[in-house]
Interface confidence: low
């Protein structure tokens, strides 16, 4: 296709002529000034049909074949004839054509979306055909194979598109180009019909990729950099398959200066120095292919940026506790820039910053530096400190913002007992929340172990963490490398910058939280009464473990007792406990013996089962009620006893057995089940009974006997008995005994309210006691009966019974007390009744 004319992104002149004309008048491409502007007024590829100064006598039935001219080649390559022999009759005034010439501009480019190749055909102002309706067709072909052949593609292989000439002066021809063919050669020619005359261009060739006209750059923005320059930045348009160069034109307009500049750059930003406060900057950008032919895009929409009268750079700083930061400032006051020597800095308009922290950077730029910063304390809704740059005593309302955050975030990790995952937790409660910030855990794994001092590595990975209900974030590493060091830190990302918490390094192997011990059992050992606790160690970790046991009485809020087992081989331990008959709850946990790692959770609790561990320590204390005529020889005797407590029954009583002994009937037993009273007929002179407590192991060994003896019931050794009410809950009983040859074992005190049919209450007390405090609820106006029974080895003696309290006279109390009770009489834990005693009880 060397007969085709290559279109490049420059202007060429096209000449159109009637048949048999000479070439003498044609302008050459070399003669075309590069300063000719296109439709947009800028340098573009343009093809111009020009036939000025050529004389034609007859335009009827004529097709003008237009040629591109060059000095080397004076031939025209004709486009395949799709006219198919049709004749066009011209209606154009030939004299006008002679004088004015027929002119068209043609521009072609590939749109920025790389899908459409566009040619615009524009009728120039001095065109005699401009008042006629144009009909424009574009014939094109994208050959499958390009061969070195002088031939034009065959007639009929061209495709034709109708160009849209909705506006007289301009027609738009659209050629769809598949993405795969962007680098191929597109052959095309134009046929323009106007006023009955056909203008046909020669065959043109073009590589669409070399004719890209990008869309204008996007997102034009301006900002003042931290070092006080104006940064103009933008984004390249989408879908451009190659890097672009950019032309930036900007103007600065201030009260003191107006300057304009035009710069070409290959980056998507441009720094303008010498920025001034109170100035207006207007900027536009366009783009074009950087490394090859192409067409400049249209200019972006103008963007205007106005600087304030006080410029802070940076305007905001986000930093961490303990760091040093600096702010710069340029101050304009009444159209004059203030000398940096006159600038004073304030914090929150409340605290003047010492001069020692200022630096004069230049005539107009002042700098203040803060050292070893403390955390910003929120002031109402403000989470920053306001830093003011002032002109001596005058401060502008604008300020810079200083955010100082304590980034000390503690990250704690634990490896699960199966050694399959490591869970790390951290909380943001310790740090001040900053609107617009996001937190992210980042980490880097070393191949082996942790380094002495963990450091933040530039290459790290983020870890997804999820907020839990307790306010902590939780991140799971799975799988894990037990002996790799995981250096991790929290990154606080914010539009103002990012901050990192101090890094920590964790070795998964060193933070293992073992599974709790399993198969935990608890039992009270029979006959010994120790609490035996046994367990199985978890499978992982394989290190030696220490164990901790906690045990306590089950039921209420358990008061735990702790016991440590340091022997890694231990699987059980026996501990003394005060109460063999209680249910104990027991839990076990474990931890590595070398001090690394964490305690496991406590195991599920094991509970002791209350079982009898020994025979009951003793039988119950018992007493009797005798019913029937006291004169009769046969009497109904009801034995009463209190259920045996656990610490005596060790640990339960299944039933009670009464052993009887009489001289006539010998010995026999009666099982009374778990009742606590039993009635039998006393018919003989002496009848001895013993109450035994039976549990699952056997019968009590130490038991109380009671002998009912007619002769003994007449033995009277209680000389006197007195009752003194101390208050409504305590009565003192005191007595005097006569000497006796019988073996006194103990006393039984009986009392009852005579005004009620209530039950008789009784107590067994030591034989050495001469007085006793009875604690019960006594109603002062009621009558009470008190009885004191001496119990001998040989039988129950005659009781002393009184039906009233002693006279309630303090003097008499004191005298009687001193008479009745001397120091040597006191037994057990009882004490002498003194004046203080009585007073104390009366008044409290």
């Amino acid at each position: 296709f060397n007969l085709s004319y290559p279109i490049t992104p420059w202007r060429f002149k096209l000449s159109c002529m009637p048949p048999n004309s000479t070439y003498d008048y044609f302008l050459l491409p070399a003669g075309l000034s590069k300063n000719t502007s296109n439709l947009n007024g800028h340098y573009e590829t343009a093809v111009e049909f020009n036939s000025s100064d050529t004389h034609f006598s007859n335009l009827s039935k004529t097709t003008f074949h237009c040629c591109f001219r060059s000095e080397q080649d004076r031939n025209c390559s004709l486009c395949a004839d799709n006219i198919e022999g049709k004749t066009f009759v011209s209606t154009v005034n030939s004299s006008v054509f002679q004088q004015m010439g027929a002119n068209w501009n043609i521009q072609c480019w590939l749109k920025g979306d790389l899908k459409l190749f566009i040619c615009y055909v524009e009728s120039l102002f001095k065109n005699p055909f401009k008042n006629y309706k144009h009909k424009v067709h574009l014939l094109y072909v994208l050959p499958e194979v390009l061969e070195d052949s002088p031939l034009v593609p065959q007639k009929g292989s061209f495709q034709m598109v109708h160009c849209n000439c909705s506006v007289h002066e301009r027609c738009e021809c659209l050629v769809p180009v598949p993405t795969a063919k962007l680098n191929d050669t597109l052959l095309m020619c134009l046929k323009i019909t106007s006023g009955g005359v056909i203008f046909q261009s020669p065959l043109m060739s073009v590589q669409p990729i070399n004719m890209v006209k990008p869309d204008p750059p996007l997102g034009l923005r301006m900002e003042i950099t931290d070092d006080g320059n104006l940064k103009i930045s933008w984004s390249s348009p989408p879908l451009v398959p190659f890097p672009l160069q950019y032309e930036v034109k900007y103007s600065e307009n201030s009260t003191t200066v107006i300057r304009e500049a035009d710069k070409i750059v290959s980056a998507t930003s441009l720094l303008v120095d010498g920025i001034l406060p109170g100035s207006s900057y207007e900027v536009q950008v366009r783009g074009k292919r950087l490394d090859g032919p192409g067409i400049w895009s249209d200019w972006s929409t103008p963007h205007v940026f106005t600087t304030q009268d006080v410029i802070y750079f940076p305007p905001k700083i986000l930093t961490s506790v303990g760091s040093n930061v600096s702010f710069h400032c340029i101050y304009k006051n009444e159209n004059k820039i203030v000398s940096s020597k006159k600038i004073v800095w304030w914090m929150n308009l409340a605290e003047k910053i010492p001069q020692s922290q200022y630096d004069v950077v230049s005539d107009h730029v002042s700098k203040v530096t803060f050292f070893n910063l403390n955390e910003t304390k929120p002031r109402g809704k403000f989470t920053y400190d306001a830093v003011y740059c002032c002109n001596e005593h005058e401060c502008h309302h604008r300020y810079a913002e200083l955010y100082v955050i304590d980034v000390n975030i503690n990250i704690s990790c634990e490896t699960d007992g199966h050694l399959t995952k490591m869970t790390c937790r951290w909380s943001t409660n310790t740090i001040q929340s900053l609107a617009g910030s996001t937190l992210q855990l980042r980490y880097r794994r070393s191949s082996l172990y942790c380094f002495d001092i963990p450091s933040i590595h530039p290459i790290s990975k983020p870890k997804d963490c999820y907020l839990q209900s307790d306010g902590f974030y939780e991140c799971v590493f799975q799988p894990i490398f037990l002996l790799s060091g995981y250096t991790m830190w929290i990154r606080i990302n914010h539009p103002l910058g990012s901050l990192d918490s101090p890094p920590t390094c964790v070795l998964p192997d060193s933070v293992v939280k073992p599974l709790p011990p399993s198969s935990v059992k608890a039992e009270i050992i029979k006959n010994i009464g120790l609490l035996k606790i046994s367990w199985e160690k978890p499978v992982f970790p394989e290190n030696n473990l220490q164990f901790q046991i906690r045990y306590g009485l089950s039921g209420k809020e358990i008061q735990w007792k702790m016991y440590d087992v340091y022997d890694a081989k231990s699987k059980s331990v026996s501990l003394p406990v005060p109460d063999f008959c209680a249910v104990y709850a027991v839990q076990v946990r474990c931890k590595r013996s070398d001090g690394l790692g964490l305690w496991s959770n406590w195991s599920n609790p094991a509970y002791t089962v209350v079982m009898d561990i020994k025979v009951p320590m003793r039988g119950p204390e018992f007493w009797r009620i005798i019913n029937g005529d006291t004169m009769k020889k046969e009497k109904n005797v009801t034995l009463l006893w209190k259920p045996l407590m656990k610490n005596d029954s060790l640990c339960s009583v299944q039933r009670y057995v009464i052993n009887h002994h009489t001289s006539c009937n010998g010995t026999w037993s009666e099982d009374v089940g778990n009742h606590t009273k039993f009635t039998f007929l006393w018919t003989e002179q002496a009848h001895t009974v013993t109450v035994l407590a039976i549990n699952s192991i056997g019968a009590s060994v130490a038991n109380f006997n009671l002998t009912f003896s007619w002769p003994m019931s007449k033995v009277n050794i209680v000389q006197s008995l007195s009752a003194y009410p101390l208050n409504s809950s305590c009565v003192i009983l005191s007595w005097i005994l006569s000497p006796s040859d019988y073996k006194l074992m103990y006393f039984i005190i009986e009392w009852k309210n005579l005004n009620e049919d209530g039950e008789i209450k009784w107590l067994r007390i030591s034989s050495s006691v001469k007085k006793y405090y009875i604690h019960d609820h006594f109603i002062p106006i009621e009558k009470y009966q008190f009885s004191l029974y001496p119990i001998f080895m040989e039988g129950v003696g005659k009781p002393k019974i009184i039906n009233s309290f002693a006279q309630d006279n303090t003097e008499k109390h004191q005298n009687d007390e001193q008479k009745l009770i001397s120091e040597e009489d006191l037994g057990g834990e009882q004490k002498l009744i003194s004046e203080e005693d009585l007073h104390h009880h009366h008044h409290h």
């Epitope: 039921g555 209420k556 809020e557 599920n604 509970y607």
Partner: antibody, heavy 119, light 108 residues
Amino acid sequence: QVQLVESGGSVVQPGRSLRLSCAASGFTFSTYAMYWVRQTPGKGLEWVAVLYSDGSNKYYIDSVKGRFTISRDTSTNTLYLQMSSLRADDSALYYCARLNWDYWYFDLWGRGTLVTVSS
Amino acid sequence: DIQMTQSPSSLSASVGDRVTITCRASQSISSYLNWYQQKPGKAPKLLIYAASSLQSGVPSRFSGSGSGTDFTLTISSLQPEDFATYYCQQSYSTPPITFGQGTRLEIK
């Protein structure tokens, strides 16, 4: 005889207060943990508050925390439930119950007192 | 808190029938489970404590079994006075003692 008798229930408006009493007799009141348990057709039986035998350990179900107070007077063997900021969902039959420590079961219940919170 | 789930929520049976009510705990509660009977207008009455121990005065036709999470109350031969609502109650986790939602036993 050993028994518990509740009193103090009535119809009250939301936001108002009420004090329930439980008179205990026939046993040493101060050696037991005492519970208030309520019953509604919707929720069934639900513990409300407990006062342990030491008199100082008190616990409440979450929904009444800060609104109800359990207390006792050992001189009169009486358990109290002071209810304030009453809500419609507090409407229930309130029982006073004695807890047996051995296996934490309720071995003695009162007959109950009805509280209706309605506007 | 430990959740207690009773099933069925109601059942119909005839005098003389053998009836079983089950109670499931949301976690293991060892044998810390008690059963109560409640008749209309009356307070609950303890039947079984510690999963299987019969409260004194309760007829021997009532029995309890189970440990861990699954428990059963069985009435071996239903009597007319047994028609009532039955509740299970866990006492493993305290003080929040929790009850099942109840099983209503009706005459068929």
